[in-house]
């Protein structure tokens, strides 16, 4: 059984969250993909989406969010630059497949943004300078507004819950690790 894990990323204000979601290449390569925030007890809210059909490794920038869909690798890269404390929350990638319900991808991201600068060296930038060298592109296709009731979520359950998906059996498990993502000076 595949486990739908939740990874916790602890970052400082101004840093960049740089994550990836993988998908079944053969099924979803050109499907439209989205980055959503899940607020407790609310419907997931779409913050950014790729074009429809999704273009290969073509960066789409919506405010401080940059999406890059690597069709040939079955990976959606998501960057959230210049993070703010209010960006803290639970995020997920989904694939839009109308008229069917959105397909949730691995993994969910629990983002915790705190004030102050972390001097720890590492893989996430505290400056957005380089990120904006990407030619800014806005989505030509609007992100669909519908969201499946099945994806309405509260905070991850204390006990393991089974969630069925079209592809595989998924166990929703509690957070086991915190990824403290370091920054570049």
């Amino acid at each position: 059984a595949t486990k739908l894990t939740e990874e916790k990323y602890e970052l400082k204000e101004g840093q960049t969250l740089d994550v990836k979601c993988d998908y079944t290449l053969e099924k979803f390569a050109s499907s439209q993909k989205a980055w959503q925030i899940i607020r407790d007890g609310e419907m997931p809210k779409t913050l950014a989406c790729t074009e429809r059909p999704s273009k290969n490794s073509h960066p789409v920038q919506v405010g401080r969010i940059i999406l890059e869909d690597y069709h040939d690798h079955g990976l959606l890269r998501v960057r959230m630059v210049n993070l703010q404390v209010e960006d803290s929350g639970l995020y997920q990638c989904v694939i839009y497949q109308p008229p069917k319900e959105p397909h949730m991808l691995f993994d969910r991201i629990r983002l915790v943004v705190t004030k102050g600068f972390s001097g720890t060296p590492g893989s996430n930038e505290n400056s957005t300078q380089n990120v904006y060298k990407i030619p800014p592109t806005t989505t030509k296709a609007l992100c669909p507004l519908y969201t499946s009731p099945r994806t309405v979520t509260q905070a991850p359950p204390k006990s393991t819950a089974d969630v069925s998906t079209p592809d595989s059996e998924i166990n929703l498990t509690n957070v086991t690790d915190i990824i403290r993502v370091p920054v570049f000076n």
């Epitope: 894990t5 960057r79 590492g122 595989s168």
Partner: antibody, heavy 122, light 107 residues
Framework: QVQLVQSGAEVKKPGASVKVSCKAS????????INWVRQATGQGLEWMGW????????GSVQKFRGRVTMTRDTSIHIAYMELSSLRSEDTAVYYC???????????????WGRGTLVTVSS | DIQMTQSPSSLSASVGDRVTITCQAS??????LNWYQQKPGKAPNLLIY???NLETGVPSRFSGSGSGTAFTFTISSLQPEDIATYYC?????????FGQGTRLEIK
Amino acid sequence: QVQLVQSGAEVKKPGASVKVSCKASGYTFTRYDINWVRQATGQGLEWMGWMNPNSGNSGSVQKFRGRVTMTRDTSIHIAYMELSSLRSEDTAVYYCARGGYTSSWRWYFDLWGRGTLVTVSS
Amino acid sequence: DIQMTQSPSSLSASVGDRVTITCQASQDIRKHLNWYQQKPGKAPNLLIYDAANLETGVPSRFSGSGSGTAFTFTISSLQPEDIATYYCQHYANLPITFGQGTRLEIK
């Protein structure tokens, strides 16, 4: 002990397929990507592709697309890389390497298998 | 694809020498660069990640610097056990590519 243990050397004929295994131990297998890198004798390192052991999804570079299949068996913590339609240029040492967390865009390889020599010869 | 060009392709130095290897990226890769050491007949070993961060357990004589397109790998005082080939690797986008390697020998 945190390690990746690969299967033994193989000799194959052109047109055949080879399946290399990589057994992970000492860490949570499904939490980190597995990557495959090959190295022809006296040559540099060539990244072939990746696999998420949790979802089973994988991707490979254009050069190998259609010829390479990456799979896993989570119950025994083994990743597999199968390369088909072998040709003499595929003669190389094939390495499995652990990547970053499955959700992270951090493609560094901090744990490597010892490599599997695949010789393609008629 | 991003091309990674290492120089020199080989070098010879004496024990105690300061050794520098450079890696040039064909486009801006920010700090998405790693350095590996590969001893003859062995698998590569991660030394530096994200351009400048020393991997756990790696001696402090190894260091890395740079960002954008120009990167440097330094051994502050060469030791006999440092005889190996060194590779840079980027991950700014896909596909991941390695430099062609720098072979280091002792004089």
